[in-house]
Amino acid sequence: SASSRRRQQSRNRSTQSQDVARVSSASDYNSSELKTACRKHELYVSFQDLGWQDWIIAPKGYAANYCDGECSFPLNAHMNATNHAIVQTLVHLMNPEYVPKPCCAPTKLNAISVLYFDDNSNVILKKYRNMVVRACGCH
Amino acid sequence: SASSRRRQQSRNRSTQSQDVARVSSASDYNSSELKTACRKHELYVSFQDLGWQDWIIAPKGYAANYCDGECSFPLNAHMNATNHAIVQTLVHLMNPEYVPKPCCAPTKLNAISVLYFDDNSNVILKKYRNMVVRACGCH
């Protein structure tokens, strides 16, 4: 049984909260798109599945999570959009062939501590930064 | 004539520099893909094109730039990949249907100063954060 698992939930889009721009928000520009809005998805990663079980002693895996979903106009408040992402969204609407939508990426990442063997077979406890996604946004 | 422009250059991928993982790098796993690796693209945004000329006095536009490109295995040193992105890349390869590749997003953003009319027609000079992409990475 594979121990890397993910759960998928749907989430409604709310209206857009803009800092940089006074933009009249289309009520639901991307209602035709079936992909949900940018959000955090749960993902448990097993170090065995990654083939790292021979050098990582503990933990056996961790809740890494990941970001996925659309960053479409209008960007709502939950999307933690940067000012640049708001501008890029509008430019994408005008020039979809040339400029992509902003992408759904981690906005907050946490560290985890890992106990592992180094190249000399010493047991090391090390904190690895930016391993766990805590929040996502449109960037 | 749209004054939002972008220039695209190709960029070679180098081998992957990993912090979190001891992973042997496939020499060119995604050579068949035509999209270039994650990088910054130049983009000039005209406020007139965005329809903001009536309230933004100056500047007339600015070099916003944007991020685009593949975040494929192996992630090279130029891609400023987080540890999470490295893990996600591997999970994507094992489960491409379920977990996307990391996305190419801004890693450094700069502010610009904008002179504009507020709702009461006062002239305001305000610094808008996170308006200009200075660097991109796989997140």
Epitope: A2, S3, S4, R5, R6, Q8, L34, K35, T36, S46, D49, L50, G51, D68 | S24, A26, Y29, N30, F73, H92, L93, M94, N95, P96, E97, Y98
Partner: antibody, heavy 118, light 107 residues
Framework: QVQLVQSGAEVKKPGSSVKVSCKAS????????MHWVRQAPGQGLEWMGY????????KYNENFKGRVTITADESTSTAYMELSSLRSEDTAVYYC???????????WGQGTLVTVSS | DIQMTQSPSSLSASVGDRVTITCRSS??????LAWYQQKPGKAPKLLIY???NLADGVPSRFSGSGSGTDFTLTISSLQPEDFATYYC?????????FGGGTKVEIK
């Protein structure tokens, strides 16, 4: 029980299109990716592409040069594979197969024979 | 694209024999390999996933080993119902690629 039931055999003319269906039952349709694999007579297995019914994400084998389209209907728990611009070399048995996260193709349809002949 | 090379393409064996089939990947795919059994006129059946994990309901005489680029499917004691064609499959990005198959025939 978990099963995938495919539509019946088809005979098609070169240049036409075929749409094969795959009805899933016994599990939550949107929780598993659906792949399509074909097998020409006496030949091996060739992966065509997949769909994730949850988000409609698709990926295709470039060998089919835009001729293949995979869709899914959540309301009927059915996946579809459409192949256009058919030629005689497309004569094959077409299979749908479920692939759970972290696993391989664990459940397969019975196969649909598509014969392309003038 | 990753290429999967199976050997031998066919073999003859007797009931009770130990049979070994190998699969080589053109790139390191770690443990991301599956084995399938296919009988004439039937759909493939999953035997092994993640290189070594036995699928539900598969007899313990089947086992998988290997990682990286070299993998092996072993049938410890061949049974009459095991005469079939066996395919390996690399699961490492897309396209998902199959080996050419190994036909196990009765000697």
């Amino acid at each position: 029980q978990v099963q995938l039931v495919q539509s019946g055999a088809e005979v098609k003319k070169p240049g036409s299109s075929v749409k094969v269906s795959c009805k899933a039952s016994g599990y939550t349709f949107t929780s598993y990716a659906m792949h399509w694999v074909r097998q020409a007579p006496g030949q091996g297995l060739e992966w065509m592409g997949y769909i994730n019914p949850y988000n409609r994400g698709t990926k295709y084998n470039e060998n089919f040069k835009g001729r293949v389209t995979i869709t899914a209907d959540e309301s009927t728990s059915t996946a579809y594979m459409e192949l256009s611009s058919l030629r005689s070399e497309d004569t094959a048995v077409y299979y749908c197969a479920r692939r759970p996260f972290g696993n391989a193709m664990d459940i397969w349809g019975q196969g649909t024979l598509v014969t392309v002949s003038s | 694209d990753i290429q999967m090379t199976q050997s031998p393409s066919s073999l003859s064996a007797s009931v009770g024999d130990r049979v070994t089939i190998t699969c080589r990947s053109s790139e390191n795919i770690y443990r991301n390999l599956a084995w399938y059994q296919q009988k004439p006129g039937k759909a493939p059946k999953l035997l092994i996933y993640a290189a070594t994990n036995l699928a539900d309901g598969v007899p313990s005489r089947f086992s998988g080993s290997g990682s990286g680029t070299d993998f092996t499917l072993t049938i410890s004691s061949l049974q009459p119902e095991d005469f079939a064609t066996y395919y390996c499959q690399g699961i490492w990005g897309t396209p998902l690629t199959f080996g050419g198959g190994t036909k196990v025939e009765i000697k």
